[in-house]
Interface confidence: low
């Protein structure tokens, strides 16, 4: 057992704020200290006139375990005209997604609505804020002139996000083009340099974005989940996205080229309504230097020996044997209605055996549905199908499940002991838990 | 042939019985005078031939007891079975399902009232009398009820613009009722006029995206037994009328709704009040609740999404799908044909697992065909009897906790067979 379950560091957020809905580590170059980033998308803020704007908190990985909100946006709604707000930040779910890379933090509000400049509407385009050191800029690529449901009006940009090594951001907007969904990628440098607080729809010269397709692709939700990894051997990270309602709800995962957003590869689920693509992750699990793909289908139903279907959840493990050549195995959940595969977190090499490891959550598993996180070790043949460790949620809640494991992030060594650590969110009890590896 | 019972140096009853199901232990301490303790462990037949009285031999036995004295079931017999097993042993019994000639029928119309459905709803005004006449041929004591649904009343599924929030149908030039998750409009009644009045009063509503909140509404209609007025003795039909696919459980994350559906009834003043705070049910959850509540679902679907519902059927035991023609002209025939199909199918499902015990259920159909219990028999008439051969195998004894009984449930029937498992794991 590598993760210390005896004395994890527990962080509590504002009650009812969904603190723990999104988690990441933060390692600014300006500080020797490490931090956790925790999204609390229903938190109240000091923004004037805004109810439950949501926030991201920066928590110290020291014994103080102090968490402080990061100020990205202190303003209320801007006005288009008198008594005619341009935007609607109440209940915008800021902090529903958060990612960091070195000094940069990207955090988003996928339920941010705006009026549009053409006519008085209320469309959930979504918005994000990018902080790089002392600089904070807004990034709302779906707040464009392409309004309404058939455009980007319902995009919900920032529903899922990631950074690439080459300093691009990847953003998922599952509602674009009548919910076909969309991926958008922009360069961090350009997002910062192009920012103008007086311009609501900023054009980015180096933007990569998927386009609208035929109506049969409506209601697919491309951009529901995202990850990055190199899948064509060019050394540039490509874009992986879950599309859980695609293929008539069998669900799909699309991989797009990180250079030009052309299609590289697709995976299709095998059971309707299993929500294949709810979560995606990419990491080399078998030590062959090719990124492998992990896809969660938390509502997958397995047919037992008696023929009865039981909803246990499933994770597809697609090993990349050579460039673009995948071999897929399936890992089923262990408990009914536990939603195994809701979150998948690459852990780095947790047990220092030369192979990367992975965490898979079943947020409604275990005693009293307190949530479980399974640790699976990598090996040369792929993923060991028997978990090496199971982390158990420790909180019960009356009004909603704790959802321990709904969000996770690993592969970062906060205590610098040579072993990568893991942070697990439990938004139903407004908690995040840091498990240190040893 | 190797005798594993007598070969080991066994000095305790418990150890002896672990060696194999054929082994026995003579409880007489002086058995085989001067011999070692191991002589008290042997095959049961050897112990008898060596002179140990039968009533002094401990061995693991297999018993199946079905009691017919207190039998209250009329369609599914036996109602209760007791099975005593030891590890490695199996027991068999027969379960009999005999459908009634004519059932009381409760038919609840659950109608998607989003704007694209307005043509189909018009047809509902006139279904009552004609349908009750047709159903009288196959059922008795026919009742109708009605409920409407649209979708979760939050962005991005509806427009939250203040001018449109209560009337989503401005584009359809319809005077719309506000959008809603699910409203129970009329409890099951034999008063056809009342049904037609309720349907006539029904206004169309609307929303933005294509999929609707049908699974939310279905689950509420299934579990809110007293509100709907489902009768225990009736065949319960839930007719879901729509032209679009349904939202899935995790779709509602788009709206910031991330609390799993708890599967309970949440109607207040006949309105589903957790629509905006709880996810849609998953297909697995929905299936479980429909079966638990003996609900047979009929999807009556207009348009190309009929195939989506048809493809769902293998994941929803007891459900069937029919295609509605333009303006729902064939709706009554669709219901009658669906009902005939429902009562002609007998399938069983194991409701709960017993740790360490495996069930194998085989249907023996009236035509002699043998099929897995979950597939069951089709074309069963009201005079037929369907037999299910149930084999129970016990794998292991070292089980902590869990249930010590299983329920075998014919899908859509209000009777079950309870199988009590008694583990024979040690010496008395």
């Amino acid at each position: 057992f590598n993760l210390d379950v005896e004395s994890p560091a527990e962080y509590a957020g504002p009650e009812g704020s969904y603190f723990g809905f999104a988690v990441d580590f933060f390692e600014p170059s300006t500080s020797s200290r490490m931090f956790l980033l925790v999204g609390a998308p229903k938190a109240n803020t000091t923004q004037p006139g805004i109810v439950e704007g949501g926030q991201v908190l920066k928590c110290e990985c020291s014994s103080s375990r102090r968490c402080q909100p990061i100020e990205f946006d202190s303003t209320g709604n801007r006005d288009y005209a008198k008594d005619d707000p341009l935007e609607f930040k109440s209940h915008q779910w800021f902090g529903a997604s958060v990612r960091s890379k070195q000094d940069k933090i990207l955090a988003c509000a996928p339920l941010y609505h705006w009026r549009t400049e053409m006519k008085q509407e209320r469309e959930p385009v979504g918005t994000c804020f990018l902080q790089d050191g002392t600089k904070t800029v807004e990034y709302a690529p779906c707040r464009s002139k392409n309004i309404d449901a058939d455009g980007q009006g319902f995009c919900q940009g920032g529903f899922s996000i990631d950074f690439t090594k080459a300093d691009r951001v990847l953003l998922g907007g599952p509602g674009s083009f009548y919910w076909q969904g969309q991926l958008i990628s922009d360069q961090v440098a350009e997002i910062i340099s192009k920012y103008d607080p007086n311009v609501y729809s900023i054009k980015y010269n180096n933007q990569l974005a998927t386009r609208t397709a035929q109506a049969i692709f409506d209601d697919s939700y491309l951009g529901y989940s995202v990850a990055v990894g190199d899948f064509n051997g060019d050394g540039i990270e490509d874009f992986v996205s879950g599309v859980p309602r695609a293929a008539r709800t069998l669900g799909m995962v699309y991989i797009y080229d990180g250079k030009n957003m052309s299609s590289l590869h697709n995976f299709t689920g095998e059971q309707m309504a299993a929500y294949f693509g709810f979560s995606v992750a990419a990491t080399d699990i078998n030590g062959d230097d090719y990124a492998d793909v992990f896809i969660g289908a938390p509502l997958f139903m397995d047919r037992g020996s008696d023929g009865k279907l039981q909803e246990v959840g499933q994770v597809s493990v697609s090993l990349q044997r050579a460039v673009g050549d995948f071999q897929t195995t399936k890992l089923n959940g262990f408990e009914v209605f536990a939603r195994f595969g809701s979150a998948i977190a690459p852990l780095g090499d947790l047990d220092q055996d030369g192979f990367n490891d992975i965490a898979i959550a079943a947020p409604y598993g275990g005693e009293d549905k307190k949530g479980l996180v399974y640790i699976f070790n990598g090996r040369s043949t792929g993923l060991n199908s028997v978990p090496s460790q199971i982390l158990e949620g420790q909180w019960a809640a009356q009004s909603m499940p704790p959802s321990f494991g709904y969000s996770m992030k690993g592969a970062t060594d906060v205590d610098r002991n040579g072993y990568p650590d893991l942070v697990v969110g439990a938004f139903g009890v407004d908690r995040a838990v840091l498990y240190r590896a040893r | 042939e190797h005798n594993r019972c007598g070969s080991a140096n066994v000095v305790s009853c418990a150890r002896c019985l672990q060696l194999g199901p054929e082994c026995g232990w003579c409880v007489q301490e002086d058995f085989v005078s001067g011999g070692s303790g191991s002589e008290r462990c042997d095959t049961v037949s050897s112990l008898i031939s060596k002179g140990c009285p039968v009533d002094s031999i401990e061995y693991l036995s297999v018993h199946v007891v079905t009691s017919s004295e207190n039998e209250i079931n009329t369609q599914v017999t036996p109602g209760e079975v007791s099975v005593q097993l030891h590890p490695g042993a199996e027991a068999n019994f027969m379960l009999k399902v005999r459908p009634l000639k004519k059932y009381p029928v409760d038919l609840y119309y659950l109608v998607d009232v989003s704007a694209s459905m307005h043509n189909n709803i018009e047809k509902l005004n006139s279904v009552g009398n004609d349908l009750s006449k047709k159903m009288a041929l196959y059922s008795r004591d026919f009742r109708l009820g009605f409920g409407s649904y649209v979708d979760k009343t939050v962005s991005p599924y509806i427009s939250i613009h203040p001018e449109r929030i209560h009337n989503q149908c401005s584009d359809y030039n319809l005077d719309c009722m506000p959008p809603h998750g699910y409203i129970h409009v009329l409890s099951l009644t034999e008063n056809i006029t009342e049904f037609e009045k309720a349907v006539h009063r029904q206004k169309i509503s609307g929303n933005i995206d294509t999929p609707e909140g049908g699974f939310d509404a279905m689950l509420q209609a299934a579990v809110c037994e007293s509100h709907i007025g489902w009768r225990k003795e009736a065949k319960r039909l839930l007719l879901v009328m729509t032209d679009q696919t349904s939202h899935l459980a995790l779709d509602s994350k788009l709206a910031g709704i991330v609390v799993p559906n708890d599967g309970n009834c949440h109607l207040k003043n006949n309105v589903y009040v957790k629509s905006t705070t709880m996810e849609h049910p998953s297909l697995g959850q929905l299936s479980e609740k429909l079966i638990d509540n003996n609900i047979n679902v009929i999807f009556a679907v207009q348009g190309k999404q009929f195939h989506w519902y048809k493809d769902l059927l293998p994941l929803l035991p007891g459900a069937i799908a029919g295609e509605i023609e333009s303006k729902a002209a064939n709706l009554n025939n669709l219901v009658v044909e669906a009902y005939k199909k429902i009562i002609s199918e007998v399938k069983v499902q194991l409701e709960n697992q017993v740790h360490g015990v495996h069930f194998n259920i085989t249907a023996i159909c009236p035509d002699g065909a043998r099929k897995p219990g979950i597939s069951g028999c089709g074309n069963v008439t009201s005079n037929d009897e369907v037999l299910f051969n149930v084999t129970v195998v016990m794998k292991t004894c070292d089980i902590m906790g869990g249930k010590n009984y299983a329920i075998i449930k014919p899908i859509g029937f209000n009777e079950t067979t309870k199988v009590h498992i008694h583990r024979s794991c040690s010496c008395q």
Epitope: A12, E15, G16, E367, Q394, W395, Q398, S399 | -
Partner: antibody
Framework: QIQLLQSGPELKKPGETVKISCKAS????????MHWVKQAPGKGLKWVAR????????TFADDFRGRFAVSLETSASTAYLQINNLKNEDTATYFC?????????WGQGTTLTVSS | DIVMTQSPSSLAVSAGEKVTMSCKSS????????????LAWYQQKPGQSPRLLIY???TRESGVPDRFTGSGSGTDFTLTISSVQAEDLAVYYC????????FGAGTKLELK
């Protein structure tokens, strides 16, 4: 922040009935069960009962079954402890509390004096 | 019912001294699944409501000074105050939440 505000002191005669209230604020009332704890003068804490604020289901400690009742007025975010047929030994301070790590909160206590 | 026994019933100390007090339960409070001991320590000053110090036998509630330490597992638990301050004079109660709730009789900490 979370606050539990209890009703004022009570002076009662043996055989009478008392109803103590506990008004909650600063959190969703139905999120946590409400507990009641007794502390007789100069004595220790004794757990009396809890009520599930979502379902209204009560649970009592063995010593407090019979004369003690707990109830809710959810719309007012208020819980009640009622003691019937009062006895001298009911003289004590009664606390309402929610027990939840990180959010453990107690009312200020209600002093009940039972004397003839 | 689980019975909680605290000792000593009172303790006279000087400021700066290290203090330990004991709490024993009539049955184990360790949940083998969660590996948590469901035992908490409370401090109560005269005329005040109790205040949570420690939960899960050894986890300090936020805002509680680090001179308070909880230890033990199963049926035997200890609260240690590494260097008693004047403001620590109070009654200390242990509470189990393994099965319903019950409190110990308390340990009174007073000045010598």
């Amino acid at each position: 922040q979370i606050q539990l505000l209890q009703s004022g002191p009570e002076l009662k005669k043996p055989g009478e009935t008392v109803k103590i209230s506990c008004k909650a604020s600063g959190y969703t009332f139905t999120d946590y069960s409400m507990h009641w704890v007794k502390q007789a003068p100069g004595k220790g804490l004794k757990w009396v009962a809890r009520i599930n604020t979502e379902t209204g289901e009560p649970t009592f400690a063995d010593d407090f079954r019979g004369r003690f009742a707990v109830s809710l007025e959810t719309s007012a975010s208020t819980a009640y402890l009622q003691i019937n047929n009062l006895k001298n030994e009911d003289t004590a301070t009664y606390f309402c509390a929610i027990f939840y790590y990180g959010r453990d909160s107690w009312g200020q206590g209600t002093t009940l004096t039972v004397s003839s | 019912d689980i019975v909680m026994t605290q000792s000593p019933s009172s303790l006279a100390v000087s400021a700066g001294e290290k203090v330990t007090m004991s709490c024993k339960s009539s049955q184990s409070l360790l949940n083998s699944r969660t590996r948590k001991n469901y035992l908490a320590w409370y401090q109560q000053k005269p005329g005040q409501s109790p205040r949570l110090l420690i939960y899960w036998a050894s986890t300090r509630e936020s805002g509680v000074p680090d001179r308070f330490t909880g230890s033990g597992s199963g049926t035997d638990f200890t609260l240690t105050i590494s260097s008693v301050q004047a403001e620590d004079l109070a009654v200390y109660y242990c509470k189990q939440s393994y099965n319903l709730l019950s409190f110990g009789a308390g340990t009174k900490l007073e000045l010598k």
